[in-house]
């Protein structure tokens, strides 16, 4: 059994997340994850899911009753999702911590928008003509 | 020239994002994107970047002066990043809209944690024995 299982069970007790009513109104993450089989699509979704859990854990970081559980799960996420690569984790954290209401951040984001957009599709790495062909229907990942 | 370029230039004017001082203290996104060549790593980072821009655009959605520009750019993101796949975009939006302070959402998230964790690494799709081998150093994605 992976180490996170016991700690996740501890969190379930703490949050009363084992109660039958928790399953009402569908799932938050599981149904969405089932929709996406392509690795790159899964990463798009998992990126949001992981940032949600990190925010959740941050809100409860000073609660001694679950601190060990939270730390174990965070460590496990770092091994599994970030491949134990601290640079990857640090870059991810930077992105999640930018404040969308900070006017300096807004200006920088808009300043960088053209270059960000140019790199958004995997096609960005190949020639322009090839790219326009792809957008004419060459691509069929779903 | 891609349609977003003209509209992004319009946003730059609106936010005074063409001023020389905008480049002070490094980039928000561009240096991070340069660090990651693997497609799945890029998607992890781009997922956060796209959600940032969507939040930013939401904050300015009622401003008539940039409404057309914002709509054009969002449409272009949908084509490039979400492959014109509305289901992908909808799932992404759901994930970005969950409130981390809502106790029902917290309980659901904790309830689903074990299953989410089990799927976090690409190794999750293969047998348990193979996964433990991978963590013993079999993997070399970069």
């Amino acid at each position: 059994q992976d180490p996170y299982v016991k700690e996740a069970e501890n969190l379930k007790k703490y949050f009363n997340a084992g109660d039958p009513d928790v399953a009402d109104n569908g799932t938050l993450f599981l149904d969405i994850l089932r929709n996406w089989k392509e690795e790159s699509d899964r990463k798009i979704m998992q990126s949001q899911i992981v940032s949600f859990y990190f925010k959740l854990f941050k809100n409860f970081k000073d609660d001694q009753r679950i601190q060990k559980s939270v730390e174990t799960i965070k460590e496990d996420i770092n091994v599994k999702f970030f491949n134990s690569n601290k640079k990857k984790r640090d870059d991810f954290e930077k992105l999640t911590n930018y404040s969308v209401t900070d006017s300096n951040v807004q200006r920088k984001a808009v300043h960088e928008l053209i270059q960000v957009m140019a790199e958004l599709s995997p096609a960005a790495k190949i020639g322009k003509r090839k790219r326009s062909q792809m957008f004419r229907g060459r691509r069929a990942s779903q | 020239q891609d349609p977003y370029v003209k509209e992004a230039e319009n946003l730059k004017k609106y936010f005074n994002a063409g001023d020389p001082d905008v480049a002070d203290n490094g980039t928000l996104f561009l240096d991070i994107l340069r660090n990651w060549k693997e497609e799945s790593d890029r998607k992890i980072m781009q997922s956060q970047i796209v959600s940032f821009y969507f939040k930013l655009f939401k904050n300015f959605k009622d401003d008539q002066r940039i409404q057309k520009s914002v709509e054009t750019i969002k449409e272009d993101i949908n084509v490039k990043f979400f492959n014109s796949n509305k289901k992908k975009r909808d799932d992404f939006e759901k994930l970005t809209n969950y409130s981390v302070t809502d106790s029902n959402v917290q309980r659901k998230a904790v309830h689903e944690l074990i299953q989410v964790m089990a799927e976090l690494s690409p190794a999750a799709k293969i047998g348990k024995r193979k996964r433990s081998q991978m963590f013993r150093g079999r993997r070399a994605s970069q």
Epitope: V79, S84, K86, E93 | W36, R139, Q142
Partner: antibody, heavy 124, light 112 residues
Framework: EVQLVESGGGLVKPGDSLTVSCVAS????????IHWVRQAPGKGLEWVAT????????FYSDSLRGRFTVSRDNAANSVYLHMSSLRGEDTALYYC?????????????????WGRGTLVTVSS | NFMLTQPLSVSGYPGKTIVISCVRS????????VQWFQQRPGSAPAMVIY?????PSGIPDRFSGSVDASSNSASLTISGLKTEDEADYFC??????????FGGGTKLTVLG
């Protein structure tokens, strides 16, 4: 003050087994990954294995996997490296090194703190 | 196979600046942090640069680290060379999942 103290080295014959130990102090041991790094006489540094903190995942050098096993006892602030089927080329100074705390995004640097090493000599 | 390649030896006069390179053979150098270690004879390695360009406390600002994606390499620069800088220097990075990788080491000789 962070301290890592290795022990258990010595002279062994080819084919024998040996376990070297490392006792840590001065930090919350269970939070940190621990690496084993070795250095043959007059040679460079070679990473051997790593064990994660609370989750105890094991990572090995491709060239050593199968013969070496890393483990830890968080209650005893200790980490162990069990080496079997030892060969002459395993003769080296074995260092215990503190890694990252991967549960903390502000963790101190990886490989910042090293022990003084324990010498393993494999010879007939 | 992943390798970090360093020059076998580098030398310089006191007060001068030397640069030790560390070239990554495959994968992107920018995708993993790079550390640098100094090792004097009979001592354990001591970190002089961590996470590409940061100095641990107690390391003078004569030591600096950088990464250049275009050459897929990292560099350690030591300015105002001193005789006590004479030592072996190792770069270190990662590949895969927590696989630690060391360069072969560079012997720095301070001349004169």
């Amino acid at each position: 003050e962070v301290q890592l103290v290795e022990s258990g080295g010595g002279l062994v014959k080819p084919g024998d087994s040996l376990t070297v130990s490392c006792v840590a102090s001065g930090f919350t041991f269970s939070n940190y990954f621990i690496h084993w790094v070795r250095q043959a006489p007059g040679k460079g540094l070679e990473w051997v294995a790593t064990i994660s903190g609370r989750t105890k995942y094991m990572f090995y050098s491709d060239s050593l996997r199968g013969r070496f096993t890393v483990s830890r006892d968080n209650a005893a602030n200790s980490v162990y490296l069990h080496m079997s089927s030892l060969r002459g080329e395993d003769t080296a100074l074995y260092y215990c090194v503190r890694g990252y705390d991967h549960s903390d995004s502000n963790s101190a640097a990886d490989l910042l703190h090293w022990g003084r090493g324990t010498l393993v000599t494999v010879s007939s | 196979n992943f390798m970090l390649t360093q020059p076998l030896s580098v030398s310089g006069y006191p007060g001068k600046t030397i640069v030790i390179s560390c070239v990554r053979s495959s994968g992107s150098v920018a995708s993993h942090y790079v550390q640098w270690f100094q090792q004097r004879p009979g001592s354990a390695p001591a970190m002089v640069i961590y996470e590409d360009s940061h100095r641990p406390s107690g390391i003078p600002d004569r030591f600096s680290g950088s990464v250049d994606a275009s050459s897929n390499s990292a560099s350690l620069t030591i300015s105002g060379l001193k005789t006590e800088d004479e030592a072996d220097y190792f770069c270190q990075s990662y590949y895969g999942n927590n696989q630690v990788l060391f360069g072969g080491g560079t012997k720095l000789t301070v001349l004169g």
